[in-house]
């Protein structure tokens, strides 16, 4: 039902869902800090624009009695329970920040009359695509899929002269929330990725993965998996790997690859890492100092969610427009705003665009080096290292099918 919003007369409130079930196991205190830091910035920006208004956040905590798995499995009802709590208390703000779990976001979107914008740090699954009042500030599965198809088809780079049309996908069910939905999207038979590939098999057992590494009868040389180096090593161990195997390790929200003094372990030589370009100052900023490299992006998305609201509020107030309207609810897309660490672009469907980076391990220096970048906004690949020091023969990525000639 329609809930009255605390969103007028110079006082604008943000409802922040603090759910026990979250896409990343980040202490809620850190998310609160991120939101409060965002509020300070927003207040400053509004004041500089001559807008004398009040902006606050209300943190809505779950009681945690029923929905206590801590991950996203029991998040579906938790989100709706929190909305009910908001409704009963008549405490709905101008915008809803959270939830991060795909299940809860999908259900909340489905079961509520959304006349207010919803900003999510997460909601990675395809089921949250193309939602009119939902904005996602962490790269959703659709963006990953488009990169992979683009990269598979690429055949005109000095280091990639073959189009690929096959892949194995390793998915054993123990993945983190982001990885679960990324791999889910690749697995889905109706997805763009599946549609564009001629052969795709999901490996669900560790042994299946391990056997493929040296199987002469394998149907593809390419294996996609999701996680960090430790995750790969736990699975692969010290096993030998055929020379034309390419492992694509999706590790989007991990800034460690760009930190000082990082050297790649031996087992990463057959691996291309797909990650996100780190923010200019985020690695050393006061905001991220207490956060682990894999959690920075999550807390940053909360902070940027606040800044996005401030951006939209400023525009609507300057134009003398009402905030509690469907127009405002639908406005959080197809725009660029000033995020904590530089401009943030949202596509036509409210999903964040970013620069994805494909890294390889230099056999000379044992360092991670940028092979290419990919701009999700324009769906375009930009080669960076034209003569990479690969482990693969002739410093070129192999064909995806052993023994097949040029395509």
């Amino acid at each position: 039902s329609q809930v009255s919003q605390n969103c007028h007369n110079g006082s604008y409130e943000i409802s922040v869902l603090m759910m026990g079930n979250s896409a990343f196991a980040e202490p809620l205190k850190n998310l609160e800090d991120a939101v409060n830091e965002g509020l300070e910035i927003v207040r400053g920006r509004l004041q500089n624009a001559g807008l004398n208004v009040t902006v606050n956040a209300t943190f809505m905590y779950s009681d945690g009695l029923i929905h206590n798995s801590g991950d996203c499995r029991s998040s579906t009802c938790e989100g709706l329970d929190l909305l009910r709590k908001i409704s009963n208390a008549q405490r709905m703000g101008c915008v809803l920040i959270g939830p991060s779990c795909t299940y809860s976001t999908f259900q909340m979107y489905l079961d509520t009359e959304l006349s207010y914008p919803m900003i999510s740090a997460g909601s990675f699954g395809l089921s949250c695509d193309y939602k009119e009042t939902l904005t996602r500030l962490m790269s959703p599965a659709r963006k990953l899929m488009y990169f992979l198809v683009n990269f598979w088809k690429t055949n005109d780079l000095p280091f990639k002269t073959y189009s690929w049309s096959t892949s194995y996908v390793y998915k054993n069910g123990t993945e983190t929330e982001d990885c679960f939905w990324y791999l889910n999207a690749l697995e889905a038979s109706v997805s763009y990725f599946s549609h564009e590939l001629g052969f795709k098999v999901v490996l669900r057992q560790d042994k299946e993965f391990q056997d493929i590494l040296m199987d002469h009868n394998r149907k593809s040389n390419v294996i996609i998996m999701c996680g960090g180096p430790e995750f790969l090593y736990k699975l692969k161990g010290d096993r030998a790997v055929a020379e034309d195997i390419v492992i694509i390790l999706v590790d989007l929200f991990n800034d460690q690859y760009f930190e000082d003094n990082v050297t790649a372990p031996d087992y990463m030589k057959n691996v291309l890492v797909l990650t996100l370009s780190p923010g200019n100052s985020l690695l050393n900023s006061s905001f991220s100092r207490n956060l682990s490299p894999t959690k920075r992006d999550f807390a940053l998305a909360y902070l940027n969610g606040i800044l996005l609201f401030g951006h939209m509020l400023k525009i609507f107030l300057e134009n003398g427009e009402n905030i509690t309207t469907p127009k405002f609810a639908h406005a959080f897309r197809n725009l660029t705003f000033e995020g904590y660490d530089g401009p943030v672009t949202l596509d036509d469907w409210g999903d964040v665009d970013s620069t994805m980076v494909l890294l390889y391990t230099s056999v000379d220096t044992k360092k991670y080096k940028v092979l290419l970048t990919y701009d999700t906004h324009v769906n375009k690949t930009y080669p960076v290292d034209m003569s990479p020091t690969f482990t693969w023969k002739n410093s070129k990525l192999p064909n995806d099918i052993t023994g097949r000639g040029p395509q």
Epitope: G228, P229, E230, Y233, G237, D238, Q256, E259, N261, V262, T263, P265, Y267
Partner: nanobody, 115 residues
Framework: QVQLVESGGGLVQPGGSLRLSCAVS????????VDWYRQAPGKQRELVAG???????TYLDAVEGRFTISRDNVKDTVYLQMNSLTPEDTAVYYC?????????WGQGTQVTVSS
């Protein structure tokens, strides 16, 4: 970064034995690998013995059969048992670890083989 502290070096006669220890500041099982390197005066540092957490061990040809690398997961300590020592084994021995992200080195312990 991982802190590594070596001990057990000293002066030993040819044919004698020594056991070097490397105390690790982190849970050893969480590391990718722990190794022993050595550097003799005027020479390059070389890998003497190494062990990955997957259990694979590697040895320098010149020490194969004489040196043994082992680890104690409870004490978070790595050992290098050195038998049948020769003057060519004289060097500073360094403990090295890689935690999947970074290399860490100890300060080294001097081993001198002389009669």
């Amino acid at each position: 970064q991982v802190q590594l502290v070596e001990s057990g070096g000293g002066l030993v006669q040819p044919g004698g034995s020594l056991r070097l220890s490397c105390a690790v500041s982190r849970n050893i099982a969480s590391l990718y690998r722990v190794d022993w390197y050595r550097q003799a005066p005027g020479k390059q540092r070389e890998l003497v013995a190494g062990r990955t957490s997957g259990g694979t061990t590697t040895y320098l040809d010149a020490v194969e059969g004489r040196f043994t690398i082992s680890r104690d997961n409870v004490k978070d300590t790595v050992y290098l048992q050195m038998n049948s020592l020769t003057p060519e084994d004289t060097a500073v021995y360094y403990c090295h670890a890689h935690d999947h992200w970074r290399d860490s080195w100890g300060q080294g312990t001097q081993v001198t083989v002389s009669s």
